[in-house]
């Protein structure tokens, strides 16, 4: 009696199942009690000897490529051996690599967690994922795993992490880069500093006083509010960051405490108060202000 090994499918793709069947065309399985064993190269597969003429392999990988055969043994210990069958496992090259961010959109608050998720639409086997920072890429990390996605995590984002990023996926057919993704690090405003600038050392009534408010840190745009004794004088915007100024034509009522507030939508901070006092120098004909 002749024995045949049939693999289904005969040209499997990596990760897919294969059924090996040990066929005996001229014998019914009811004619005799047989034990079956499947081999790859020189190694027995699965449970070894079994009464089933089929062996189900859950997932085939590139390294499972090889020469397969089966043996059947009767109760009388007569062993039949099939011819060898070559099974070539086909690897699918990586394709359509993309990089996404968590949080989505690439906007992240300073100190928060950022995850760069590299995905491939297609690709089988061990895929090596690499993450790069900057258009001229600095390699951050590489991971090799049998999955279509991999993650790179920055647990606590800093201002210096604001950059372009991309990832590369590779499974033996050459590297395939994703598109660029830009990360914007949103920074809450720091406590602003208020400075009073007058045209002379001692400002007089009718002089123009410049209130300059500046938060040294914070993502633009920054909106600055100016206060005199907690009464709003007005607001100024700094679309590109930096400080902003508010001008005031002085009267005697402008004595008192001044402060400013910076707000960029990520939180507001109030400056320390700056006090402006009138002084009347001896023999002077006009009031003066000092701060």
């Amino acid at each position: 009696a002749e024995l045949f090994l049939i693999a289904s499918p005969s040209h499997p793709t990596e990760g897919s199942p294969v059924t090996l069947t040990c066929k005996m065309p001229f014998l019914q399985s009811s004619d005799a009690q047989f034990q079956f064993c499947f081999f790859r190269d020189t190694r027995a597969l699965g449970p070894g000897w079994s009464s089933s003429p089929k062996l189900q392999i859950a997932a085939m990988w590139k390294e499972d490529t090889g020469s397969y055969w089966c043996e059947a043994q009767t109760m009388a210990s007569k062993v039949l051996r099939s011819r060898r069958s070559q099974i070539n496992v086909h690897r699918v090259p990586v394709a359509d690599v993309s990089l996404e961010t968590q949080p989505p959109g690439g906007q992240v608050m300073e100190g928060d967690r950022l995850v760069l998720i590299c995905s491939v639409a297609m690709g089988t086997g061990d895929i090596t994922f690499l993450w790069y920072k900057g258009a001229v890429g600095l390699n951050l990390q590489s991971k090799t795993q049998r999955s279509l996605t991999a993650e790179y995590e920055i647990p606590s984002v800093r201002e210096s992490d604001a950059e372009q990023y991309y990832c590369v996926a590779e499974n033996g057919y050459g590297p395939s880069p994703s598109g660029l993704v830009s990360i914007t690090v949103r920074i809450p405003v720091s406590r602003p500093i208020l400075m009073l600038r007058a045209p002379r050392a001692q400002a007089a009534v009718e002089d123009v006083l410049e209130l300059h408010c500046e938060a040294l840190r914070g993502s633009p745009p920054i909106l600055y509010w100016f206060y005199h004794e907690d009464i709003t004088l007005g607001s100024r915007s700094a679309p590109s960051g930096g400080g902003a100024s508010f001008n005031l034509s002085l009267t005697e009522e402008h004595s008192g405490n001044y402060s400013c507030e910076a707000n960029n939508g990520l939180g507001a901070q109030r400056s320390e108060a700056v006090t402006l006092n009138f002084t009347v120098p001896t023999g002077a004909r006009s009031n003066h202000l000092t701060s």
Epitope: G106, Y132, A135, V136, L138, Q164, Y166, P177, L180, S182
Partner: antibody
């Protein structure tokens, strides 16, 4: 297929401004940086800077800061280069080019736009 | 700025003969990531530049194997093993390692 198509030649007066466009097609516009290169008549090539269309963030050669403003419009897949306060030495052909990261090279170039500054 | 100096500036060649262009940078153009971003472009009259070689010695797809690049650090060379008529034009080396990125002044290759 990938294409970068630039706007036509411009004749402009000294002191004026001009905006050159570079329309991209055949790929995802926000996935690659667009660079600009200057070539004065009979001269070599000078790198001006790049823009990332994803967020409109530009990076300039210091020499061209103040002279050049790079912008991009995602909705039309178009990059722009504006030249201001034009002088005769700004007369040149200006090229846009796509640069592929990881492999790192300019793989596609626009056909060039001649800007002539003359009164 | 990194100055890229090419030589010769003009190169008359004989068809079928080899040709060589040198490019020297004023400082090392090895990037902090270990790569050297040295490229060669060919610009034919009235056309945009076209990429030939990237990262010193990698030939761009579709570029004939008669073109080869070599070098390291500050000294780089582009070689054409057998010049063909379609090879005429101006050859530029370019460094993309240090901002501002810079081109060489160009080498004009023409048939004798």
């Amino acid at each position: 297929q990938v294409q970068l198509v630039q706007s036509g030649a411009e004749l402009v007066k000294p002191g004026a401004s001009v905006k050159v466009s570079c329309k991209a097609s055949g790929y995802t516009f926000t996935s690659y940086n667009i660079h600009w290169v200057k070539q004065a008549p009979g001269q070599g090539l000078e790198w001006i800077g790049w823009i990332y269309p994803g967020d409109g963030n530009p990076k300039y050669n210091e020499k061209f800061k103040g002279k050049t403003t790079l912008t991009a419009d995602k909705s039309t897949s178009t990059a722009y280069m504006e030249l201001s306060s034009l002088r005769s030495e700004d007369t040149a052909v200006y090229f846009c080019a796509r640069r592929i990261h990881y492999y790192d090279y300019f793989d596609y170039w626009g056909q060039g736009t001649l800007v002539t500054v003359s009164s | 700025d990194v100055v890229m100096t090419q030589s010769p500036l003009s190169l008359p060649v004989t068809l079928g003969e080899p040709a060589s262009i040198s490019c020297r940078s004023s400082q090392s153009i090895v990037h902090s990531n270990g790569n050297t971003y040295l490229e060669w472009y060919l610009q034919k009259p009235g056309q945009s530049p076209k990429l030939l070689i990237y990262k010193i010695s990698n030939r761009f797809s579709g570029v004939p194997d008669r073109f080869s690049g070599s070098g390291s650090g500050t000294d780089f060379t582009l070689k054409i093993s057998r010049v063909e008529a379609e090879d005429v034009g101006v050859y530029y080396c370019f460094q993309g390692s240090h901002v501002p990125w810079t081109f060489g002044q160009g080498t004009k290759v023409e048939i004798k």
